[in-house]
Interface confidence: low
């Protein structure tokens, strides 16, 4: 049986076996067409979600789409239903928590009374006073806390309990891919993972150790990316894959958060990174032990310069890594977090491409979360 | 400290116009709506309409409609309100008064002006 | 427009008097409501916003309390400087309106 799985799909009406290679390659070789069901799925960008979280506190702000302008939502008035609908609609099913933030001196957005209608919110029809001079911060999940703050260093052996939302994509049992737990559900990658094998079934998420192939593996049901934009082969390279059971958080299965859609990492700003990753550039050994490393943003402007990248990293990537090189993400790496720490953990980044690992003028390269944030809600929207 | 100060007391006839200043200072200009409000001897108080001072959008009470004009500059940190077609009612005292929350449309008025007395008279 | 209405219109009291003034709204208007002083030939000054919120700098003997169309201000112990009109706001929906004013006066 297990050599029958490996290497041979069974179709269902009238019950035969196509080799496993029929599998997703856009032909249906079952009469049902059951072969390319279960396939990684594009998903397009998507219209524009109409609420979104600031980091100024995590306030809550609200398109009005008539006008496309942004409104800040006051806290007159709000009730745990809006603050649950405001939640629904960037995809989250958790319940949210939600406090009254004062209004601060660099307040730039009109602030406005919330209200709800089909499901979604709203500004109230009059011109919205906001007599209490507070804003509502908005948390739709408990995520970005670990047990253990890791050390500022250049790399070293991590902990699972310094990264708890880091997980292993295992195809057929080998580690391709690192990723972060995002929410019960769902875990966030990057698209290049899949190139080579599309179908869902062997694709595994391995959760809860720094250990590779040390814990059990969880089955997954979905996995989506962007539509391919052969424009820009590179751009677009995040892939969100749904669990087929939801996970159980605990010390060390926790999520990450996502940025919030205004975080500008300016050159410098500390980072982390973490990975399985290969050791050395030229082959040498993927890690069994999970490696953290603290490494910086880079001035876009930089890497895109003539001895770098020359003007291949887009505005939804970002670099990272340290000036005098040496440190950086390599094989195995791709598809795990680029992490910020504020309050929480956010996941800034996701490991994508560079040249070479760890080259002074070629640091790593990112997809930019914070650029996908749209995609990601329509996605679980689409999927609640 | 946050402070605003209005131009002096004006004398026109009826069908003139009037153009009162106001200058903030002391707090982030654009950041706070300007409204205006008025007074007509021993009378109550009667809103007469903001201004935005980032877009210099405005709401106008429909009494004043088509007759008021609001407007700012930026550079000096002044708004102005025009009525124009005046009459002997409109002699009142004019004030203008900032939002007390930055963002905020009209959560309560906290500075005003001094205010500016019109006296529309032939 | 919503229809501010305010009683009394005037009030004689002495210093050390409790003073409540009521201010009724035509429709619901929540807690969108404020409370100005205003002293002959001065402009008028915010006490208490959102019904019930005390204007940094105001003393502790005004407070309001109401929600919904009826709201009250109340002066707690009546001081020489208290003795000016009384105005009521709503800020609930545009255009705002004020109440007609009560004034309060010396005994």
């Known amino acids: 049986k297990v050599i029958l799985d490996k290497y041979y799909f069974l179709c269902g009406q009238p019950l035969h076996f196509i080799p496993r290679k029929q599998l997703c390659d856009g032909e249906l070789d079952c009469p049902l067409g059951e072969d390319e069901e279960h396939c990684v799925k594009s998903f397009p960008e998507g219209p524009a979600v109409a609420v979104r979280l600031s980091k100024d506190r995590s306030t809550l702000q609200v398109l009005d789409s008539a006008t496309g302008n942004w409104f800040s939502a006051c806290f007159d008035n709000f009730t745990e239903a809006l603050a649950e609908t405001a939640c629904r609609q960037m995809g989250y099913s958790s319940k949210p928590t939600f406090r009254a933030v004062e209004i601060g001196p660099d307040q730039d957005l009109d602030v406005v009374e919330i209200t709800e209608n089909s499901q979604e919110l709203r500004m109230r029809n009059s011109s919205g006073p906001c007599l209490s001079g507070s804003l509502v911060s908005l948390h739709c999940l408990a995520c970005g806390k670990s047990l253990k703050t890791p050390r500022v260093v250049g790399v070293e052996e991590a902990s699972v309990d310094s990264w708890p939302w880091q997980v292993s994509i295992q195809y057929d049992k080998q580690h391709v891919c690192g990723g972060s737990i995002l929410d019960p559900h769902w875990v966030l990658t990057a698209a290049h993972c899949f190139r080579k094998h599309t179908d869902v079934f062997n694709w595994k998420v391995r959760a809860g150790s720094d250990k590779l192939g040390s814990f059990p593996s969880l089955a997954v049901a979905k996995i989506i990316i962007i539509e391919f934009n052969p424009m820009y082969p590179k751009d677009n390279d995040i892939a969100l894959m749904k669990l087929q059971f939801p996970l159980t958080f605990s010390g060390t299965v926790r999520p990450i958060c996502l940025p919030f859609f205004d975080e500008e990492l300016t050159p410098a700003t500390p980072l982390w990174i973490i990975g399985w990753g290969f050791t050395k550039q030229n082959g040498g050994k993927m890690s069994d032990i999970l490696l953290q490393a603290s490494v910086q943003v880079i001035d876009s402007t930089r890497c895109n310069a003539d001895d770098a990248y020359q003007g291949e990293v887009t505005e939804k990537m970002m670099c990272a890594g340290i000036p005098e090189g040496g440190v950086d993400t390599c094989q195995g790496d791709s598809g795990g977090p680029l992490m910020y720490q504020s309050d929480q953990w956010h996941v800034v980044g996701i490991v994508s491409w560079g040249y070479g690992c760890g080259g002074p003028s070629t640091p790593g390269v990112y997809t930019k979360v914070s650029a996908y944030l749209n995609w990601i809600y329509n996605v679980w929207k689409a999927e609640l | 400290q946050v402070q605003l100060v209005q131009s002096g007391a004006e004398v026109k006839k009826p069908g003139a116009s009037v153009k009162v200043s106001c200058k903030a200072s002391?707090?982030?200009?654009?950041?706070?709506?300007m409204h205006w409000v008025r007074q007509a001897p021993g009378q109550g108080l009667e809103w007469m309409g903001r201004?935005?001072?980032?877009?210099?959008?405005?709401n106008y009470a429909q009494k004043f409609q088509g007759r008021v004009t609001m407007t700012r500059d930026t550079s000096t940190s002044t708004v102005y309100m025009e009525l124009s077609s005046l009459r002997s009612e409109d002699t009142a005292v004019y004030y203008c008064?900032?939002?007390?929350?930055?963002?905020?449309?009209?959560?309560?008025?906290?500075?005003w002006g001094q205010g500016t007395l019109v006296t529309v008279s032939s | 427009d919503i229809q501010m209405t305010q009683s009394p219109s005037s009030l004689s009291a002495s210093v050390g008097d409790r003073v409540t003034i009521t201010c009724q709204a035509s429709?619901?208007?929540?807690?969108?409501l404020n409370w100005y002083q205003q002293k002959p030939g001065k402009a008028p000054k915010l006490l208490i916003y959102?019904?019930?919120s005390l204007q940094s700098g105001v003393p502790s003997r005004f407070s309001g309390s109401g929600s919904g169309t009826d709201f009250t201000l109340t002066i707690s112990s009546l001081q020489p400087e208290d003795f000016a009109t009384y105005y009521c706001?709503?800020?609930?929906?545009?255009?705002?309106?004020f109440g007609p004013g009560t004034k309060v006066d010396i005994k």
């Open positions: 008064a900032r939002v007390r929350v930055r963002g905020v449309i009209h959560p309560g008025f906290d500075p």
């Open positions: 706001q709503q800020s609930y929906s545009t255009p705002v309106t």
């Open positions: 959102a019904a019930s």
């Open positions: 429709q619901d208007i929540s807690n969108y």
């Open positions: 201004i935005n001072p980032n877009s210099g959008e405005t």
């Open positions: 002391g707090y982030t200009f654009i950041g706070y709506y």
